[in-house]
Amino acid sequence: LRPSRVYKPEGNTKRALTLKDILNGTFSYKTYFPNWISEQEYLHQSEDDNIVFYNIETRESYIILSNSTMKSVNATDYGLSPDRQFVYLESDYSKLWRYSYTATYYIYDLQNGEFVRGYELPRPIQYLCWSPVGSKLAYVYQNNIYLKQRPGDPPFQITYTGRENRIFNGIPDWVYEEEMLATKYALWWSPDGKFLAYVEFNDSDIPIIAYSYYGDGQYPRTINIPYPKAGAKNPVVRVFIVDTTYPHHVGPMEVPVPEMIASSDYYFSWLTWVSSERVCLQWLKRVQNVSVLSICDFREDWHAWECPKNQEHVEESRTGWAGGFFVSTPAFSQDATSYYKIFSDKDGYKHIHYIKDTVENAIQITSGKWEAIYIFRVTQDSLFYSSNEFEGYPGRRNIYRISIGNSPPSKKCVTCHLRKERCQYYTASFSYKAKYYALVCYGPGLPISTLHDGRTDQEIQVLEENKELENSLRNIQLPKVEIKKLKDGGLTFWYKMILPPQFDRSKKYPLLIQVYGGPCSQSVKSVFAVNWITYLASKEGIVIALVDGRGTAFQGDKFLHAVYRKLGVYEVEDQLTAVRKFIEMGFIDEERIAIWGWSYGGYVSSLALASGTGLFKCGIAVAPVSSWEYYASIYSERFMGLPTKDDNLEHYKNSTVMARAEYFRNVDYLLIHGTADDNVHFQNSAQIAKALVNAQVDFQAMWYSDQNHGISSGRSQNHLYTHMTHFLKQCFSLSD
């Protein structure tokens, strides 16, 4: 028998984290995002579910909707109408895909203090929202859009083409929801509430993915989803705009697609209202290296939307795909003509540009060997954005203000020196014209949310500082986290290392690599987390490392586009390089190195295990992609092109996990997948398993019946992490 190797944190009254702590969410943190309703007013749902109104300037606060009203319909969410007369209450939340869900909606009249009766909303509703002015309601029911001029009015049906799994109006189909829009909706009100723009997705010709949902019945149900895999027929999209003042007078008006886009397969990528009669649409060729931003105007006399060519702005990538993960959206100036947008500069770094007439004449606003990440708000005199510029750490996020009123514009970092050790990764939430804003810091210390004056940047108050969490962590031995970079040849890789408490460089520790590695992702971030890997370091004495290899984001296009058309090569290579460097550091036990990942990370971990290097003793792949032909068209083709002979079929074929089945012979492999995974279909793991069986390679596997890509139901999640913990401890010869 091997002597058991038990890691015991030495002489300390503090206790180590337990797996139970993680599974119970004992150390989860809170953030505070104001629900802005004006320049200086916001709503927030309190701990006890009252909806509270706050006025920053008068310091006034009161309950506008009591928890008893919420409870009366089991509401879990709410939305105040802009005229403040009504609130919708959302209940019976029923999750569909990543963003989509259906729910039951009740309208509460704040004036009368009662629910609106008569012409009640149908159920379940797929999406519902107020107009930006007044209290018009738009909602999607059974794939059709309806309009109510007032909550108590009868509904007006705007679309009639909706049909389950065939035609979607105002809501995206599966692939658009997951890979393009990242929303549950595909409709947008004009700023004054006159027009409602929406997308119609026609999935009639899309192949169906079908899988069993076992449930409790005698026979399983079959789930059918129109899901275009790489190279398959895609949804056909059309954008319409309806005048909601007289919806019966003139029907929905179709917005024309730019001719350079319409000449072959294309995608709609986003819609931005510029003014009450000007709209901006973004389109993308199916080969996603050309994006066109088209500005369209309403012609009242013709009841038509016109998109002149001089208002078509083309963004093209010559080294990869357009945009980052998504093509960025424009932030328009007050003049409703010029806008600010993030795209790659001549050096391949994503930066803010100001476009007044043509993209060719764009004025670069930010520059440097770092990237602008997001434009939060453009006002008359300021532009607020986030970037990873500060101190050269790609995994940080700070908020900056550019005074665009000044000439030349001056730049100020709003967050860099606020709580320098605690806070290095920020996001923000601005009131309408940025008179006030909230900063939400995610770490590396305990998250904290604060309220600020938009003119002076002065902190007004702390909204949430996670005091309870701070107190409960006082007696916990947390691991030490380091973020550093390693160099190999001409390449620099940032890594995060999570070191066990009382880490001693002279000792040897098992190493677990956690990998995601997907294009335009980032794992090495300066954020706070107490999760499974924190536990593994704290209690089990395992060193954890996360490495951002080529293909990951925010370090320039040269690094990002390195993986273009050849997924599965450099992502794996760079993990292997990093492991070799970690071994050189002297505190890693070479005999006990493992790798694990989920989704794209499952793909990379599988390929790393099958790399034939002998570096890994064991590894885990959860819900891995096994072939890019099995994954969604929009995603696969963005990075790989088409799986056709005259395009990139060869690399589609030789980048599969199945092609490397033989190489799993000398590693312990645990393959895990949910059978109801709508995203990375169970098919992926079924094919890996088949290939391993055919190659007579032993492996371990676990499926989770009726679980989706997140394997997130309480019982399944507990089982999953317990199972993976046992597997790892066995691999590393750590006793239970």
């Epitope: 029907g251 008006m253 179709e254 024309p256 105007d297 013709w302 038509a304 002149p308």
Partner: antibody, heavy 116, light 112 residues
Framework: QVQLVQSGAEVKKPGSSVKVSCKAS????????ISWVRQAPGQGLEWMGG????????TYAQKFQGRVTITADKSTSTAYMELSSLRSEDTAVYYC?????????WGQGTTVTVSS | DIVMTQSPLSLPVTPGEPASISCRSS???????????LDWYLQKPGQSPQLLIY???NRASGVPDRFSGSGSGTDFTLKISRVEAEDVGVYYC?????????FGQGTKVEIK
């Protein structure tokens, strides 16, 4: 490439009606204005009216109001112009055009001759 | 209806020389969105008209850069920097600011 193909030449008697068709191919039809323009022999261009097929509401020049009817069939991507109570001065080449602020496509023209 | 008046109605030109046509509208063609809804067309002998300039000053695709449009409100000009033999034909301005579109009478450009 967008193409507009019009119906063939017509010879009509005064007082009768003529219906000219314009079939679009190779591009989107619905969101664009389809205009009808005529040109009498040796004369300039005269705008008669138009329609946005997707909306279906036609607009007519005052001069032709009550005599012209413009329609569109989205399913066949075809627009129609019907002119009634024909007189000899309606003898002209009738063009359909798809316009979109910045680019236009014209049919080859249909010659309508009105003579007794 | 908006009345469009072109001048001159006939323009004899010498190849290589510049040429200019004026178009005046009876009402402003400047829309609240900032665009001037005025287009210029050329109809070559025996052909359908073709768009040259849209929204007052923007060249349509495929139109040589010797053609330029300028003006705002009620006064517009089409310029040809160096006339070529293939530029002969009748030039029309058309307003699209009003529900009822109207053409100018046309300017016949011919080689001297």
């Amino acid at each position: 490439q967008v193409q507009l193909v019009q119906s063939g030449a017509e010879v009509k008697k005064p007082g009768s009606s003529v219906k000219v068709s314009c079939k679009a191919s190779g591009g989107t039809f619905s969101p664009y204005t389809i205009s009808w323009v005529r040109q009498a022999p040796g004369q300039g261009l005269e705008w008669m009216g138009g329609i946005v097929p997707n909306v279906g509401v036609a607009t007519y020049a005052q001069k032709f109001q009550g005599r012209v009817t413009i329609t569109a069939d989205k399913s066949t991507s075809t627009a129609y112009m019907e002119l009634s109570s024909l007189r000899s001065e309606d003898t002209a080449v009738y063009y359909c055009a798809r316009d979109a602020a910045d680019r236009d496509y014209w049919g080859q023209g249909t010659t309508v001759t009105v003579s007794s | 209806d908006i009345v469009m008046t072109q001048s001159p109605l006939s323009l004899p030109v010498t190849p290589g020389e510049p040429a200019s046509i004026s178009c005046r509208s009876s009402q402003s063609l400047l829309h609240s969105n900032g665009y001037n809804y005025l287009d210029w067309y050329l109809q070559k002998p025996g052909q359908s008209p073709q768009l040259l300039i849209y929204l007052g000053s923007n060249r349509a695709s495929g139109v040589p850069d010797r053609f330029s449009g300028s003006g705002s409100g009620t006064d517009f000009t089409l310029k040809i920097s160096r006339v070529e033999a293939e530029d002969v034909g009748v030039y029309y301005c058309q307003q699209r600011n009003n529900k009822n579109r109207t053409f100018g009478q046309g300017t016949k450009v011919e080689i001297k």
